[in-house]
Interface confidence: medium
């Protein structure tokens, strides 16, 4: 392997030594330690955990470990004035109120500072009105309501089920539809897997369980008051009215017992089809308002949360590279949790901790990586990826010049079925090669490779005998590194069987029931899946930091660029008449992709054949590989999304969690048939095609022979 050629002090200090040092029992111990009390961003408990991690990383042997703090906008419920939703009668009397907190799990009854369920950054307000059920509150759900069913949400409180898309997109869609408030709930159809018991007897969501979460639409901005710049002591802060991404209407989450009470009385229009019906024993009528006998009753929200500038703390650990200390490979994951964080994030943080310990053990024996490895424990991820984004804003000049790769390390598990990887195409071959060397933890695959079980359980839709790797979207701390700075990024975790478990996320996501016991009893009793994820994440970091030649294959980018060009062309071709009328052509884009493919192929030949012992040549070739991802960055950003600058990938405008390819062209084409000025709309499509063409061609040229 290429890593064996690297700067190992002795032959035993190789990838195998690093992987062999990783222990499931340690991950288990670390997870238990990290999950005994809540670690909400901005609280004393999370500051204390930051200091503990700093201390332990120093003990493990890192060269330096620093706390970096920022003062960012966070949001909390009012402790003396709880949030809730009522059904009120014609006299204004509250005849039903939603719960004020989740019933705590056994053994945690006396834990203080469990934040009650709330939608972070909701404005205060007490809207009152008729209810409209809007399914998942996706773009297409509002199209169905407004265009097909002619239902007007203006002045109404909408109730939407969690799932399918990021909750912030739901709120944005409701605002655009004119709603005065949003109620989010977890439907058993999405958060209760058939045949599994509710927590504490299984891993399903009980009726009193509620998903917390932020409802921002930051589009990569970081702290809402300091977009583009670190939220330090001399930062200029916007007023709340000018803050980025804050919702304008009150929002509150509830569980399915409470949702039953709101939905069972719904009248008005019937649901359009079965895709709008969940698993509660209610009619799933759309409304507006309650049926017959209850038509005089209304819904009232009581939201009193406050947003306040609060100090957060990242932990940044450094393991200096022996040969290229100015080249950074970053492993980062967040530390803050909504409550106990049994899965999110501490199943990831425990893995990072064990990876640091293993690297530290090798370092204590005299080894150093070729390149510098940075380890990060991010704060305030749950409040909008704030810790990672502020740190990257503060260090952007260093990162754009020195950043080789970023590996994300949030939740290690969201199931225990198979591996899930999302990454830049540059890392495909790294991931394939690594997983071929690792042992599968799956039952029935004893003695087989992880690659084999992964390929069997999650096959690529395009290439036979290969596993699926997905596009990077957002909703996690890689966002600023990949979408803003253009640093090659990847993430890996164990996941569920998407064929049989179609619920969104895992049922207990962001609830009080996400405990150590949930993981230890139901998901990974032997911590073998955690160990496998540690091996994948740690192995990727080891190779990226230690390989003489960076383990990036630019030919894989060429393959996906062709696939994405075909896809966007086919979308456009749904409008053949308009393409003809407005002279819309994709020829230039396909030409640029062809050029990229040819140049990438030639570059790969030179990479194979060049003299690896020549340090200048080696550095030159590695820089071309490192800067390829950077070449896809447009400094002007995407339309109305200046911090999403990657031209090939961006978070979907309709679902932050999902990645979209050629997002500029995609958004220009989206719903184009409804645009009032088709000439202008198709002009924008042409502009976006030209930007994509230029970017692909410019990126290709960075791989050409230098002189």
């Amino acid at each position: 392997k290429s890593s064996s050629e690297a700067t190992n002090i002795t032959p035993k200090h190789n990838m195998k030594a690093f992987l062999d040092e990783l222990k499931a029992e340690n991950i288990k111990k670390f997870l238990h330690n990290f999950t005994q009390i809540p670690h909400l961003a901005g609280t004393e408990q999370n500051f204390q955990l930051a200091k503990q991690i700093q201390s332990q990383w120093k003990e493990f042997g890192l060269d330096s470990v620093e706390l970096t703090h920022y003062d960012v906008l966070l949001s909390y419920p009012n402790k003396t004035h709880p949030n809730y939703i009522s059904i009120i009668n014609e006299d204004g009397n509250e005849i039903f109120n939603t719960s004020l907190f989740e019933p705590p799990p056994a053994g945690y009854e006396n834990v203080s500072d469990i934040v009650p369920p709330f939608s972070a950054f909701s404005p205060q307000g007490m809207p009152e009105g008729d209810l409209v059920y809007v399914n998942y509150a996706r773009t297409e759900d509002f199209f169905k309501l407004e265009r097909d069913m002619k239902i007007n949400c203006s002045g109404k409180i909408v109730i939407a089920r969690y799932g399918k898309v990021f909750r912030g997109n739901k709120v944005k869609n409701a605002q655009l539809a004119g709603a005065t408030g949003v109620i989010l709930y977890s439907d058993p159809a999405d958060y209760f897997a058939p045949g599994v018991k509710s927590y504490p007897d299984g891993w399903n969501l009980p009726g009193g369980g509620v998903q917390r979460g932020n409802i921002l639409n930051l589009n990569g901005a970081g702290d809402p008051l300091t977009p583009g710049y670190p939220a330090n002591e001399y930062a200029y802060r916007r007023g709340i009215a000018e803050a980025v991404g804050l919702p304008s209407i009150p929002v509150h989450p509830i569980g399915y017992y409470d949702a039953q009470k709101l939905l069972e009385k719904m009248g008005g229009s019937a649901s359009p089809d079965s895709s709008w019906r969940g698993s509660l024993k209610v009619p799933y009528n759309v409304g507006p308002g309650f049926t017959g006998n209850f038509s005089t009753q209304k819904v009232k929200m009581h939201i009193h949360s406050t947003s306040e500038v609060t100090r957060i703390y990242n932990v940044i650990g450094t393991l200096r590279g022996a040969v290229e200390p100015d080249r950074y490979v970053i492993l980062g994951g967040h530390r803050d949790s909504w409550v106990f964080g049994g899965i999110d994030p501490q199943s990831g943080a425990a893995v990072v901790h064990e990876i640091v310990r293993s690297f530290g053990t090798l370092k204590k024996e005299g080894w150093r990586p070729r390149r510098t490895i940075l380890f990060a424990s991010w704060d305030a991820e749950e409040f909008g990826l704030l810790g990672s984004t502020e740190w990257a804003e503060e260090n952007s000049r260093l990162l754009q010049e020195r950043g080789v790769a970023y590996i994300n390390a949030d939740s290690s598990i969201e199931g225990n079925y198979t591996l899930r990887v999302d990454c830049t195409p540059l890392m495909y071959s790294l991931v394939y090669n690594l997983t071929k060397e690792l042992e599968s933890p799956d039952e029935g695959f004893e003695g087989k490779s992880l690659y084999e079980s992964w390929t069997k359980k999650s096959p690529s839709p395009e290439f036979s005998g290969m596993p699926r790797i997905s596009k990077l979207g957002s909703g996690n701390d890689f966002e600023v590194f990949f979408q803003r700075l253009g640093i090659a990024s990847g993430r890996a975790r164990y996941t569920k069987n998407w064929e049989t478990n179609k619920f969104s996320s895992y049922p207990l996501y962001h609830s009080v029931y996400e405990t150590y016991e949930l993981v230890e009893k139901f998901y990974d009793p032997m911590f073998k899946y955690h160990l496998t994820v540690a091996q994948v994440r740690g192995g990727m970091v080891f190779e990226l930091a230690n390989s003489v030649v960076l383990p990036f294959d630019c030919r894989d980018y060429a393959v996906v660029l062709r696939k994405y060009a075909d896809k966007i062309y086919n979308i456009s071709m749904k409008h053949p008449q308009e393409m003809k009328t407005y002279s819309v052509s994709f020829d230039s884009l396909f030409s640029a992709v062809k050029n990229f493919t040819e140049i990438a192929s030639k570059f790969s030949e030179r990479l194979r054949d060049f003299d690896k012992s020549n340090p200048i040549l080696l550095r030159m070739m590695n820089d071309q590989l490192m800067f390829l991802e950077r070449a896809f960055i447009d400094p002007l950003g995407l339309p109305d999304r200046p911090f999403y600058r990657h031209v090939i990938y961006a978070p979907s405008s309709h679902n932050k969690y999902a990645g979209e390819s050629f997002p500029g062209i995609y958004d220009a084409l989206f719903d184009i048939e409804s645009k009032v000025d088709p000439s202008q709309a198709w002009g924008e499509v042409k502009r976006q095609i030209s930007i994509a063409t230029f970017t692909v061609q410019a990126a290709a040229e960075t791989l050409s022979e230098v002189a």
Partner: nanobody, 127 residues
Framework: EVQLVESGGGVVQPGRSLRLSCAAS????????MHWVRQAPGKGLEWVAY????????YYADSVKGRFTISRDNSKKTLSLQMNSLRAEDTAVYYC????????????????????WGQGTMVTVSS
Amino acid sequence: EVQLVESGGGVVQPGRSLRLSCAASGFTFSGYGMHWVRQAPGKGLEWVAYISYDGSNRYYADSVKGRFTISRDNSKKTLSLQMNSLRAEDTAVYYCAKDPAWGLRLGESSSYDFDIWGQGTMVTVSS
């Protein structure tokens, strides 16, 4: 051991007040709705009041509405029933009972069932 222990019963004149308490142990009190139920001499069981696990919802039988108030203190694992304007027909053994559904929020029309009972405390309203 799962236990509910009522206290506070006694003899009281019509129109006066009494406060019943129920101490819970052996289960996650803060996760369950709680009820008061009564049984008058020679009669069947009558449901009196319900409070949700977090205290946000309280429901009462029509016969006690406006006179009785159910409350709970999750930190102390206690359930209370404040009985005002007592009448002769309120004479009964009062039981506190745990709802079987963890975190369930009952509506006024629901049929109530219980999985853990106390031993009861006698309330006699007589002049």
